[in-house]
């Protein structure tokens, strides 16, 4: 089939001691091959400091996956979710303040 760019969605969930878990979800993309990783100040985190989801079919002939890491509250600006898919790339910031969801569709 033809290339379908991912919808990328970054969310935050509060955890204890001033730390938050940030999760980056990519969905509705084709083909299956994708790079999705957290960057701190533009540099990828080590693999062992991120949690990864499998790339799974989402039922529409496309795929979905996710990656998460833990950061200090107040340092959201330093972190971006980096996505590369079928020759396209993008960086997606962590929502700061009251906004806890950020969606972006790649074209």
């Amino acid at each position: 089939g033809s290339t379908v760019p991912p919808m990328v969605n970054v969310t935050c969930s509060e955890v204890s001691e001033g730390n938050i878990t940030v999760t980056c979800r990519a969905s509705s993309f084709y083909p299956r091959n994708i790079t999705l990783t957290w960057r701190q100040d533009g540099v990828s985190l080590s693999h062992n400091t991120q949690q990864w989801g499998d790339v799974l079919p989402d039922g529409n002939g496309t795929y979905q996956t996710w990656v998460a890491t833990r950061i200090r509250q107040g340092e959201e600006q330093r972190f971006t979710c980096y996505m590369e898919h079928s020759g396209n790339h993008g960086t997606h910031p962590v929502p700061s303040g009251n906004s806890h969801h950020h969606h972006h569709h790649h074209h």
Partner: antibody
Framework: EIQLQQSGPELVKPGASVKVSCTAS????????IYWVKQSHGKSLEWIGY????????ISNQKFTGRATLTVDKSSSTAYLHLNSLTSEDSAVYYC???????????WGAGTTVTVSS | DILMTQTPLSLPVSLGDQASISCRSS???????????LEWYLQKPGQSPKLLIY???NRFSGVPDRFSGSGSGTDFTLKISRVEAEDLGVYYC?????????FGSGTKVEIK
């Protein structure tokens, strides 16, 4: 080959401003941040800040807040460091640098010497 | 700001010697998620710095295996197993776990 080409030396008067450029080649400019580092003569290195060329987002060392402005021109794959209200303390070599997958300053420009003198 | 203290400031060596440089941070530079962004750079006179080691112990592409990095928390070490003439210059440690990023004051490795 990945390269960062910096603008030439600058001699400026106290109180004036200067704009240093850093033109990237050999890679997709919006894939990687551009960092700026200061080195005063015979001294250590000082991180100024960085810019994400994809989003335009910046993070800076508070020491330089209000005096250093980081911008990019995506069409020419060029990053700029704009320094204002210059004093003799700003006389230094200014480097731009680019990270890699897991490291910060993997590629450096050759540096731009800024001399502040009346 | 996190202060990066390097010792010694000057390290006179004979070619073929082992050299060891210490870098101590004023607080732990292990980030919340376990990431430790500690790097080592070498700057030769009139040149831009060059990356040697990233994330404490990983050698950058093209860096000879006589260079090794180790440490954790607040204490880090760069070792050169057999110093060669091309290794002379100023070595800097650098932390990017916390903003502002900070460099050590430098260690000059020179011939005895």
């Amino acid at each position: 080959e990945i390269q960062l080409q910096q603008s030439g030396p600058e001699l400026v008067k106290p109180g004036a401003s200067v704009k240093v450029s850093c033109t990237a080649s050999g890679y997709a400019f919006t894939k990687y941040n551009i960092y700026w580092v200061k080195q005063s003569h015979g001294k250590s290195l000082e991180w100024i800040g960085y810019i994400d060329p994809y989003t335009g987002g910046t993070i800076s060392n508070q020491k330089f807040t209000g005096r250093a402005t980081l911008t990019v021109d995506k069409s020419s794959s060029t990053a700029y460091l704009h320094l204002n209200s210059l004093t003799s303390e700003d006389s230094a070599v200014y480097y731009c640098a680019r990270p890699g997958s897991y490291w910060y300053f993997g590629v450096w420009g050759a540096g731009t010497t800024v001399t502040v003198s009346s | 700001d996190i202060l990066m203290t390097q010792t010694p400031l000057s390290l006179p060596v004979s070619l073929g010697d082992q050299a060891s440089i210490s870098c101590r941070s004023s607080q732990s530079i292990v980030y919340t998620n376990g990431n430790t962004n500690l790097e080592w750079y070498l700057q030769k006179p009139g040149q831009s710095p060059k990356l040697l080691i990233y994330k404490v112990s990983n050698r950058f592409s093209g860096v000879p295996d006589r260079f090794s990095g180790s440490g954790s928390g607040t204490d880090f070490t760069l070792k050169i197993s057999r110093v060669e003439a091309e290794d002379l210059g100023v070595y800097y440690c650098f932390q990017a776990s916390y903003v502002p990023f900070t460099f050590g004051s430098g260690t000059k490795v020179e011939i005895k």
